[in-house]
Amino acid sequence: FERTRSLQDPCSNCPAGTFCDNNRNQICSPCPPNSFSSAGGQRTCDICRQCKGVFRTRKECSSTSNAECDCTPGFHCLGAGCSMCEQDCKQGQELTKKGCKDCCFGTFNDQKRGICRPWTNCSLDGKSVLVNGTKERDVVCGPSPADLSPGASSVTPPAPAREPGHSPQ
């Protein structure tokens, strides 16, 4: 099948880093400067991505693979292949159209990106709040209030009383 395909389509023989050049009677030609083809059989080479402005180069372009970008400090990647850079905020904040804003009471964000999320509602699981939440941290849920009441099974029973007149072993 491969042989049949190559006889029918000379372009199928062109390896990565080349393209099938219609201007040269469909012979394989190396990709021109600042372009690439990452697979064989291409009819054109793609222009290399340029990491400019808030983007910085994580991996240089080559004739067989595109450049890869990430974001300059203070920004983070969004989208497939880091198609966008979004401003970082501090923990306890979220990015709005007007910039970084503190999380509202009852919400938190423990990262430099993303939105403020509501504190966990411990009572939904029948638990109590062990540590209060902050803008940067979620609440920590503890045992249920019933577990803390006297006579509850989870409370450790007192040590048995020693008989009078007996010294410790």
């Epitope: 190396p30 021109p32 400067p33 004739s63």
Partner: nanobody, 111 residues
Framework: AVQLVESGGGLVQPGGSLRLSCAAS????????WSWYRQAPGKQRELVAW???????HYTDSAKGRFTISRDNTKKTLYLQMDSLKLEDTAVYYC?????WGQGTQVTVSS
């Protein structure tokens, strides 16, 4: 424009070696892609080996492991070292620098 002149072709037995040279003159400093092609009798010209614009050497399947492309920038010369030559390597070999072609040098592999 760039002028290219190939040399080093000849008659060689199967399993033998040849070293082709391609001397360049003119303004070569802006050229970043250098290639060797070949054309066998009755066949289409085909890419054999090349220096991509990122300075990495590449080879087509027919040349891998047997041919080595190199260059000497001070001498403005591109080379193709061909080892373990086979009958099917018989062709006219051409040097190419983006838009310029040499006149070719004949390589004949015959016992």
């Amino acid at each position: 424009a760039v002028q290219l002149v190939e040399s080093g072709g000849g008659l060689v037995q199967p399993g033998g070696s040849l070293r082709l040279s391609c001397a360049a003159s003119g303004n070569i400093f802006s050229i970043r892609v250098w290639s060797w092609y070949r054309q066998a009798p009755g066949k289409q010209r085909e890419l054999v080996a090349w220096f991509a614009w990122d300075n990495i050497a590449h080879y087509t399947d027919s040349a891998k492991g047997r041919f080595t492309i190199s260059r000497d920038n001070t001498k403005k010369t591109l080379y193709l070292q061909m080892d373990s030559l086979k009958l099917e390597d018989t062709a006219v070999y051409y040097c190419n620098s983006e838009d310029s072609w040499g006149q070719g040098t004949q390589v004949t592999v015959s016992s």
